[in-house]
Amino acid sequence: KSSNEATNITPKHNMKAFLDELKAENIKKFLYNFTQIPHLAGTEQNFQLAKQIQSQWKEFGLDSVELAHYDVLLSYPNKTHPNYISIINEDGNEIFNTSLFEPPPPGYENVSDIVPPFSAFSPQGMPEGDLVYVNYARTEDFFKLERDMKINCSGKIVIARYGKVFRGNKVKNAQLAGAKGVILYSDPADYFAPGVKSYPDGWNLPGGGVQRGNILNLNGAGDPLTPGYPANEYAYRRGIAEAVGLPSIPVHPIGYYDAQKLLEKMGGSAPPDSSWRGSLKVPYNVGPGFTGNFSTQKVKMHIHSTNEVTRIYNVIGTLRGAVEPDRYVILGGHRDSWVFGGIDPQSGAAVVHEIVRSFGTLKKEGWRPRRTILFASWDAEEFGLLGSTEWAEENSRLLQERGVAYINADSSIEGNYTLRVDCTPLMYSLVHNLTKELKSPDEGFEGKSLYESWTKKSPSPEFSGMPRISKLGSGNDFEVFFQRLGIASGRARYTKNWETNKFSGYPLYHSVYETYELVEKFYDPMFKYHLTVAQVRGGMVFELANSIVLPFDCRDYAVVLRKYADKIYSISMKHPQEMKTYSVSFDSLFSAVKNFTEIASKFSERLQDFDKSNPIVLRMMNDQLMFLERAFIDPLGLPDRPFYRHVIYAPSSHNKYAGESFPGIYDALFDIESKVDPSKAWGEVKRQIYVAAFTVQAAAETLSEVA
């Protein structure tokens, strides 16, 4: 099908013209420009960058570019009263203190306003007590400690290694276990890949490097003081005691040099098994407390950070659609960084900048997309997805009626091995078709398609000859669009080889060492992977905004719904006796999935045959496709998580980064054997099956013939 038909423009202005205009050298130049100083949310430097991007997007040719500001709760260390952790002796003397800042990377020694490592939104406090090592502080780690090892974390300071799950979940788990403080550290087992040197000689984490990050449990709320509504000039703000998602105990992050000093003295229980051991030369004893000679020593935290309502700025650019200006395709990524943002976010922001430039070039030559494209540079993503969420709250009525798709554009790379895509099933075919048309940048795949290298390196676990595409979780700015509003969403980036590199994320994530040089020297010297990601993200936006019929295939949703129903059924069937006792049946869900499959199949047949020259019918069919994702939204939300409203997908309750399917049923079944009232617990399982079955059936009916 032609992407140009409806806009009556010269054939040269097609996807190829857009893709050919994207240049690696420009992405490189933009990345350099965006990474020379820190751009922490709420600072003057980040406001200045917002204005620079606004100005450049205007120059590139967008119809309008506006700043959208909000006053949200942010968190900063106290400049004159630094945060640190001590080992204290029986007299209360500090015999060891953790570092106050990271050693700056070469060339950046004189840069001011580098925020020292801290856990954003930690409350103030100076707790002291015995240490307990809790591995990754996952739900299962606390189960092991409390249930198997009978170790009580109440009144203890816990030390947990970063990795596996979102840090906010670690803190929540520690709070629930009764801990009075949390120390987070990066273990070389997770953040130091064998055979690679530390920065600045390689891409590994040095001993003084520390991962910053927020420790909120917002569950999609956005600004903690204005959940559900924009933090505008006339906002009513909750008191800090009623704020959403704030941790109640002090938390602080450290590097592995400092962790070594804390962990080497640990006594108490030995680690339960090898999965609790990292790579430091320490015993990884669980505790509580230090061993014999050091048993009178304690750990003391000194946390003095403050929470402050601060102004943030999104940049919103508009390229008006020629045919359907009231249909929005959104490309968004954040601008704020913890320090220099060499990867997170500026490797993504540089790609967005080049995509905007390419679209602008086409527009200056007389072309317009069929649908409106909105470009967003979000602020305060690192503080809880605040900029994107506040903007979506402010514009929710427009978005729910007009939002076609959202493509996320945070870090373009987390490695240089192969493509990684997470998206709604509606976009599977779009991604497959697009990557078949793009050249692979990978060594050994010269002249081959991106689809081919991706499929070879990251095969689908279910379908041979196809690449892996993952579920959307959270931890990034698509959250409000997908999980709250039900707008079809996707994200793409280049990633590492998960088989050979089992560390979590990339080693220098959220550290001062995430610089331009890190990318230019070690990850992507030719910027060919950045260019490929620009082609994937930009190509998706182009097709979504320009194809006559929306490039969504509802049959792919049918396939995954069956897979997810099978999975949740098999989880439930681990309790056959209870299912029988409480008359738990999944028949309604399987029936709804069967109906969805049949109706989706018939809809797809009609989609092939209808008269595309009839604008009313075309619009009707496209609206059914656009609103299908919306049909999976339950206005009441998930239990205790009102802003996670998608019935098919939600961020895992145990790891915000991961997506969970049929999350309502999954959470109702989780650890059900330990519930004090089994009848009530299984009643909730039945209710969640009912909600899921109803939602799938209701969604199916939106694809039926309208009359």
């Epitope: 060891f96 570092s99 106050l100 050693p103 700056p104 003084g208």
Partner: nanobody, 123 residues
Framework: EVQLLESGGGVVQPGRSLRLSCAAS????????MNWVRQAPGKGLDWVAF????????YYADSVKGRFTISRDNSKNTLYLQMNSLKPEDTAVYYC????????????????WGQGTMVTVSS
């Protein structure tokens, strides 16, 4: 050129004070732990004090604990040693020495030395 230049030595009476300085050039002091080391006439080298790159930890030899204070001003690329209650046995050439490892939390091997400054404690 990478170098360390000590100053502030001299002759002083027992019980008095002296402040040594060590100016770094050619490398960023801010990234490295720093040491003071001394060599008494006819003796071997003795480690005196260590300060982490960020000033968060200071370690001292037992012989100087409570009398000497190591400090640094990263903005001036300078290391200091405040020596109080000096004793004749503190007589030595005092060297500042840069730690080999960026960000080390405890003293490690030294890789850059100054030329030293002589301190003589005598009545």
């Amino acid at each position: 050129e990478v170098q360390l230049l000590e100053s502030g030595g001299g002759v002083v009476q027992p019980g008095r004070s002296l402040r040594l300085s060590c100016a770094a050039s050619g490398f960023p002091l801010i990234s490295y732990g720093m040491n003071w080391v001394r060599q008494a006439p006819g003796k071997g080298l003795d480690w005196v004090a260590f300060i982490t790159y960020d000033g968060s930890n200071r370690y001292y030899a037992d012989s100087v604990k409570g009398r000497f204070t190591i400090s640094r001003d990263n903005s001036k690329n300078t290391l200091y040693l405040q020596m109080n209650s000096l004793k004749p046995e503190d007589t030595a050439v005092y060297y500042c020495a840069k730690d080999r490892i960026v960000g080390a939390r405890v003293p490690d091997a030294y890789d850059i030395w100054g030329q030293g400054t002589m301190v003589t404690v005598s009545s």
